[in-house]
Interface confidence: low
């Protein structure tokens, strides 16, 4: 807490300008009017205040707005935002996307701080759902943001927001998250033609069911191995050798390098060795010739 002292004669600040950087902490406290500071917050960022001087400015705003800052002030906090604690931010009501962008910009290039996490929490809570513009903004600053959401939370993301998602935004998503996102992506991109559709849907295919993979295999999509390896094992297992060959196109040769890894390993175990041999890749582990293959799932359905 800064001690209350009278402002020296002639030092009363008439505006927020560069001359204030030469003020001592106690002079800033005594000579800068909090209301003046609030109305000229947009100037603070252009002035190289020290870390400790910013503490004083924050203290003045805290005194003026004990219940939380108004959005007109929040939008122009600039580097003063870095002085805010999560408990300060919890008092705010941030509704403008421009305000959110301005504050995220301050933290750009750094890990998501506790302050930023709280800010996003408050903003999304205020909006009620993760709309396209918000998602676009958040993933631009924090590519992993989408994958930090629970499947339940992702379920409230409207399909229109999926257009904002870039492939790198899904890098850390797990299968449960992709299970939720894939149907939304399918809906969002449904009016695109074959090749364009595949480019857009590719990142979401970790949530695709078997029937959709079968459909894709008829469209000469040439799926790369990295995408294939992220597919759900249960969705890959029912695919025939011919379907996988069509799905991967020239990339089918990559199966050899991945034959010990899921889902390739499990898929191989389900195929006839005869069929695997037609690929000419030397894949081993298929069902030997002459063995009877029982489709247990069909048997259960019949009983």
């Amino acid at each position: 807490e800064v001690e209350k002292t009278a402002c020296p004669s002639g030092k009363k600040a008439r505006e927020i300008d560069e001359s204030l950087i030469f003020y001592k902490k106690w002079e800033l406290e005594a000579c800068v009017d909090a209301a003046l500071l609030a109305t000229q917050m947009d100037r603070v960022n252009a002035i190289p205040f020290t870390y400790e001087q910013l503490d004083v400015l924050k203290h003045k705003l805290d005194e003026l707005y004990p219940q939380g800052y108004p959005e007109s002030v929040i939008q122009h906090l600039g580097y003063l935002f870095l002085k805010m604690s999560p408990e300060d931010i919890r008092k705010w009501n941030v509704t403008s996307l421009e305000t959110l962008k301005a504050l995220l910009e301050v933290n750009k290039g750094h890990e998501m701080s506790p302050q930023v996490a709280t800010l996003i929490d408050r903003f999304v809570k205020g909006r009620g759902q993760l709309d396209k513009d918000t998602l676009d903004t958040l993933t631009a600053f924090y590519p992993g943001y989408l994958c930090s959401l629970s499947p339940e939370e992702l379920s409230s993301v409207p399909p229109s927001s999926i257009w904002a998602v870039r492939p790198q935004d899904l890098d850390t998503c797990d299968p449960r998250q992709l299970d939720v996102l894939y149907p939304k992506a399918r809906l969002a991109f449904q009016n695109m033609n074959g090749s364009e559709y595949f480019v857009k849907i590719q990142s979401f295919l970790g949530g695709a069911p078997t029937e959709d993979l079968k459909a894709l295999s008829q469209q000469n999509v040439s799926m790369d191995l990295a995408t294939f390896m992220k597919l759900r094992t249960d969705a890959v297992l029912p695919l025939t050798v011919a379907e996988v060959q069509k799905l991967l196109g020239p990339h089918v040769e990559g199966l050899k390098a991945e034959e010990r890894h899921r889902p390739v390993r499990d898929w191989i175990l389900r195929q006839r060795q005869d069929d695997l041999d037609t690929l000419g890749l030397g894949l081993q582990g298929g069902i030997p010739n002459g063995y009877l293959v029982l489709d247990l799932s069909m048997q259960e359905a019949l009983s």
């Epitope: 750094h110 506790p114 996490a117 709280t118 930090s148």
Partner: antibody
Framework: EFQLQQSGPELVKPGASVKISCKAS????????MNWVKLSNGKSLEWIGV????????SYNQKFKGKATLTVDQSSSTAYMQLNSLTSEDSAVYYC?????????????WGQGTTLTVSS | DIVMTQSQKFMSTTVGDRVSITCKAS??????VAWYQQKPGQSPKLLIY???NRYTGVPDRFTGSGSGTDFILTISNMQSEDLADYFC?????????FGAGTKLELK
């Protein structure tokens, strides 16, 4: 009285997964972020990640991304941490700890710890 | 990541001593620092938050000081029940990081 009650000790084989629970009582579960911290022999405390119970949104220490998955069940006021592809390096005591923003985001309440032993 | 360095792994002390445990941050963390006490077989307990604020119920012989990069936890009148490990932690930015700890032992 605030309490974070963690699940009991675990002995698991390498390659397996384990899910540790942390049941909160005595306060509003969704009002406070929940952190997970690792304490291994001869090492300091390591922060694993934090989850916001209100939304299930989480943030991880880069070192534990892919290793740990944090979830919550609001209905039972319980936080969970799943650790997968376990190795002997994962043998440690794991704590859940409440992050109270009033106290400057410090960890003001800790569970009693869950000892995980990974051994064949 | 911000590295929190507690240079003294062990400190020998006697009852009634004034003990100062130091912690240095690799970059400016303001006052976003907490101190914890951990006794054998127990979980850590919060002593100090925001570098110098004593947590509810913590005896006033424990005081925290410092800001920026250098922090000190002082026990003004060492008691036998204070024999424990003490950790500093920064929460200025993710990932949250802890010091390696300082163990107080009897001389």
């Amino acid at each position: 009285e605030f309490q974070l009650q963690q699940s009991g000790p675990e002995l698991v084989k390498p390659g397996a997964s384990v899910k540790i629970s942390c049941k909160a009582s005595g306060y509003s579960f969704t009002d406070y972020n929940m952190n997970w911290v690792k304490l291994s022999n001869g090492k300091s405390l390591e922060w694993i990640g934090v989850i916001i119970p209100n939304y299930g949104t989480s943030s991880y220490n880069q070192k534990f991304k892919g290793k740990a998955t944090l979830t919550v069940d609001q209905s039972s006021s319980t936080a969970y941490m799943q650790l997968n592809s376990l190795t002997s390096e994962d043998s440690a005591v794991y704590y859940c700890a409440r992050w109270d923003n009033y106290y400057g985001s410090s960890l003001d309440y800790w569970g009693q710890g869950t000892t995980l032993t990974v051994s064949s | 990541d911000i590295v929190m360095t507690q240079s003294q792994k062990f400190m020998s002390t006697t009852v009634g001593d004034r003990v100062s445990i130091t912690c240095k941050a690799s970059q400016n963390v303001g006052t976003a620092v907490a101190w914890y006490q951990q006794k054998p077989g127990q979980s850590p307990k919060l002593l100090i938050y925001s570098a110098s604020n004593r947590y509810t119920g913590v005896p006033d012989r424990f005081t925290g000081s410092g800001s920026g990069t250098d922090f000190i936890l002082t026990i003004s009148n060492m008691q036998s029940e204070d024999l424990a490990d003490y950790f500093c932690q920064q929460y200025s930015s993710y990932p949250l990081t802890f010091g390696a700890g300082t163990k107080l032992e009897l001389k």
